[in-house]
Interface confidence: low
């Protein structure tokens, strides 16, 4: 069937609409020239290909002018749709961003996704990470097997649209102590919190003598 | 830049199998057409099959030759394109290329994969 | 008769010009046709489809190679030889189901 109207379809090609356009048109292979302006390209049947003379190149393609002839030549831009030129995409296949002619899965550093367009935008504009602070816990680095270690980076430019959100700028990570104890006597936090009960008792009891003497004090003046 | 890399070449006896792999990149390999093109030792080029995308339901071409004994398949998902060879003959021996056909024509060739059959 | 007919071998002098020559059998007569550089040990790569008095270049194919047509003949010119293109030329040609290549032309530079 598929021959069958292979065959027809060549058979009636000089008067068929795909020769509209064409400087030269074969029974075989269609347009083989086009009219100045008009863009040449291949359509595939089978393996047998069929020229035709368009005014824009479909989807996919861009217009290649050339001194012989002008053309339309394959986007060769990873995961593009439509191309201006060779090497500039103006499309995008669905799920990947436009930026700078070129399609991303991800928007590159610096550039953030706009969702309703498909494009990667100015974004907020971070600097270089500092290095891994200390490894540290409450502002000390002993006395815990654990701790934290810290990096930042600042904000070099606002993001030009105020729904793009900055990137985090610090981070952390666990991290394993230089020293387990605290040398010279520094406590560990059990016996800070020993010593910490002490000392409230005391301040209560040393309140409640207070207490006791401004009433001792009070009657006295009565 | 477009990359094709074939694999699975080797030593075989005839009546044997073998599988061919080619692992395409720098382009978006579901659109592409794909080849694998042959060449005997000394020879000329022959090509060997052609597979369509999925826009074609995956049609395939076999070359005279090879029909009935060779089936050319894709995974669009790994952008890899394979060549189950079986029943292999002695005249079966050359380096086999993997080849980008998009264009309507073998634009893009991959370094080649050598397949010795050979009892 | 087959379908492509390329001569074996051709020499010529470097820095001058050379035309290699395809011969279509008379039912691919008017088919567009390609052509292939190989060196040796090397893959093959596309230089350029040759249609009816035009011709579409790949990539990296230098302005010195140009493609022609004269009724079932296809020719590739190389103008100003270099030694880099001392190498065998293969033409193709794609058909309804199958695609052809000619025995191809080693080019051997004096």
């Known amino acids: 069937q598929g021959n069958r109207w292979r065959r027809s379809k060549r058979a009636s090609y000089v008067s068929n609409p795909i020769c509209k356009g064409c400087l030269s048109c074969s029974k075989d292979n269609g347009c083989s020239r086009c009219q100045q302006k008009l863009f040449f390209f291949l359509r595939r049947e089978g393996m047998r290909q069929y020229g035709e003379c368009l005014h824009s190149c479909p989807s996919g393609y861009y217009g290649h002018r050339a001194p012989d002839m002008n053309r339309c030549a394959r986007c060769r831009i990873e995961n593009c749709d439509s191309c201006f030129s060779k090497d500039f995409c103006t499309k995008c296949k669905v799920g990947f961003y436009l930026h700078r002619g070129r399609c991303f899965d991800e928007c590159p550093d610096g550039f953030a996704p706009l969702e309703e367009t498909m494009e990667c935008v100015e974004g907020c504009e971070v600097g270089h990470w500092s290095e891994w602070g200390t490894c540290s816990r409450n502002n000390r680095t002993c006395g815990f097997k654990w701790g934290l270690e810290t990096r930042t980076r600042q904000i070099v430019k606002k993001p030009a649209k105020d729904t793009i959100p900055c990137p985090t700028i610090a981070e952390s990570r666990r991290c394993k102590m230089a020293m387990r104890h605290c040398p010279g006597g520094k406590r560990t936090p059990k016996a800070k919190e020993k010593r910490n009960k002490k000392k409230k008792r005391k301040l209560i009891e040393r309140a409640q003598e207070q207490h006791s003497v401004f009433l001792a004090t009070d009657r006295a003046n009565q | 830049e477009v990359q094709l890399v074939e694999s699975g070449g080797g030593l075989v006896k005839p009546e044997g199998s073998l599988k061919l792999s080619c692992v395409a990149s720098?382009?978006?390999?579901?659109?592409?057409?794909m080849s694998w093109v042959r060449q005997a030792p000394g020879q000329g080029l022959e090509w060997v099959a052609h597979?369509?995308?999925?826009?074609?339901?995956?049609?395939?071409y076999y070359s005279g030759s090879v029909k009935g004994r060779f089936s050319i398949s894709r995974d669009d998902s790994r952008n890899m394109v394979y060549l189950q060879m079986n029943n292999l003959r002695t005249e079966d021996t050359a380096t086999y290329y993997c080849?980008?056909?998009?264009?309507?024509?073998?634009?893009?060739w991959g370094q080649g994969t050598q397949v010795t059959v050979s009892s | 008769q087959p379908v492509l007919t390329q001569s074996p071998s051709v020499s010529a002098s470097l820095g001058a010009s050379v035309k290699l020559t395809c011969t279509l059998s008379?039912?691919?007569?008017?088919?567009?046709i390609e052509w292939y550089q190989q060196h040796p040990d090397k893959s093959p790569k596309f230089l350029m489809q040759?249609?009816?008095?035009?011709?579409s270049k790949g990539d990296g194919t230098p302005d010195r190679f140009s493609g022609s047509s004269s009724g079932a003949h296809r020719y590739l010119s190389i103008s100003n030889l270099q030694l880099e293109d001392e190498a065998i030329y293969y033409c193709g040609l794609s058909d309804v189901s199958l695609y052809l290549f000619g025995s191809g032309t080693q080019l051997t530079l004096l």
């Open positions: 008379s039912q691919h007569s008017t088919n567009y």
């Open positions: 597979i369509y995308t999925k826009t074609y339901n995956y049609a395939t």
């Open positions: 080849t980008t056909d998009e264009d309507w024509y073998f634009d893009f």
């Open positions: 720098g382009f978006t390999f579901s659109d592409y057409f």
């Open positions: 040759v249609r009816d008095g035009s011709h």
